[in-house]
């Protein structure tokens, strides 16, 4: 809390400028008039004020709004929206997509801080919608939002905006996340040639079906065994012995140390194990020689 | 994270010059601006002079004419030359940086100047 003193003769700030940098923090709270500031928040953000001082400035604004920023006040924050708390912005009522963008350019190239996340859900809930608009903002700040969304939200995600994603920021999609994401990151990666687009479309094969599998095996992708354990299960699992090896390429040789995981351990169960033989890993488990394999579903699905 | 080492302060008389300089290291892809600061003694710290990213500068007026803040980006160093230099300019200077989501201060060097 700064101090309540009276403003030193001829201080009184008549306009938000420059001179202000060169007064301390009591002569902020002495002399500058909330009002004042309000009206000329949108010079703030081109001063260069100490965070020291954007306190002050943010000291007198919460005086003058106690239940919360206009959106007119909001959109001219700029840095001082690093001196929000949560609390703070749950107070706004935010319906505009520029001062959503104008605040998250404040935070850009770092982490979504707890304001961020904060300012958002505010302005998600202010909405009613997650619209395409919104989504594409979102995503061109935070490619990692994507994995914070359910897959009902997803599916409003345009393909366009699957370009700006990175490997490490579907590190926390779960698979029905994932289910939703790779048909639109195929499609937007359909026109690239086959090692260019594997290695776009790797992050996202946890939502690959077997068929897509299949076709990969066939491009010499080489996929590692990282990527190869993220795959679904029942995408798995209806992959032979070759089309797994012609999958791995050279790092075939990396499931005998996965062989107790899932999906290899389900994909082992269901082959043959001469099949598994011919990898030469020593794989075991497979279905013995002789036996006859009955496909339950298929018959099912027939009757 | 931003570090601050300031150097290059001393004892000098009336008249004379001095050259203070800031060695700035960590995330100083952060910063937004940086600025010498000084706290005489009994004092209130107060600042001395500004100089943004794009080289903006901004002078107190009891040093205007006298002190020119610069820097070297391909050192990150701040700089400060105090030229005429008076009794009343006898303080610590703290060298500051204002960076992603906060200010960063050295640990300051004490300026004396006496005859």
């Known amino acids: 809390e700064v101090e309540k003193t009276a403003c030193p003769s001829g201080k009184k700030a008549r306009e938000i400028d420059e001179s202000l940098i060169f007064y301390k923090k009591w002569e902020l709270e002495a002399c500058v008039d909330a009002a004042l500031l309000a009206t000329q928040m949108d010079r703030v953000n081109a001063i260069p004020f100490t965070y020291e001082q954007l306190d002050v400035l943010k000291h007198k604004l919460d005086e003058l709004y106690p239940q919360g920023y206009p959106e007119s006040v909001i959109q001219h924050l700029g840095y001082l929206f690093l001196k929000m708390s949560p609390e703070d912005i749950r107070k706004w009522n935010v319906t505009s997509l520029e001062t959503l963008k104008a605040l998250l350019e404040v935070n850009k190239g770092h982490e979504m801080s707890p304001q961020v996340a904060t300012l958002i859900d505010r302005f998600v809930k202010g909405r009613g919608q997650l619209d395409k608009d919104t989504l594409d903002t979102l995503t061109a700040f935070y490619p990692g939002y994507l994995c914070s969304l359910s897959p009902e939200e997803l599916s409003s995600v345009p393909p366009s905006s699957i370009w700006a994603v990175r490997p490490q920021d579907l590190d926390t999609c779960d698979p029905r996340q994932l289910d939703v994401l790779y048909p639109k990151a195929r499609l937007a990666f359909q026109n690239m040639n086959g090692s260019e687009y594997f290695v776009k479309i790797q992050s996202f094969l946890g939502g690959a079906p077997t068929e897509d599998l299949k076709a990969l095996s066939q491009q010499n992708v080489s996929m590692d065994l990282a990527t190869f354990m993220k795959l679904r299960t029942d995408a798995v699992l209806p992959l032979t012995v070759a089309e797994v090896q012609k999958l791995l390429g050279p790092h075939v040789e990396g499931l005998k140390a996965e062989e107790r995981h899932r999906p290899v351990r389900d994909w082992i169960l269901r082959q043959r194990q001469d099949d598994l033989d011919t990898l030469g890993l020593g794989l075991q488990g497979g279905i013995p020689n002789g036996y006859l394999v009955l496909d339950l579903s298929m018959q099912e699905a027939l009757s | 994270e931003v570090q601050l080492v300031e150097s290059g302060g001393g004892l000098i008389q009336p008249g004379g010059s001095l050259r203070l300089s800031c060695a700035a290291s960590g995330n100083i892809g952060s910063i937004r601006h940086m600025g010498w600061h000084r706290q005489a003694p009994g004092k209130e710290r107060e600042l001395v002079s500004t100089i943004t990213t794009v080289g903006t500068t901004y002078y107190a007026n009891f040093v205007k004419g006298r002190f020119t803040i610069s820097r070297d980006n391909s050192k990150n160093t701040l700089y400060l030359q105090m030229n005429s230099l008076r009794a009343e300019d006898t303080a610590v200077y703290y060298c500051?940086?204002?960076?992603?989501?906060?200010?960063?201060w050295g640990q300051g060097t004490l300026v004396t100047v006496s005859s």
């Open positions: 500051r940086a204002t960076a992603h989501p906060t200010d960063y």
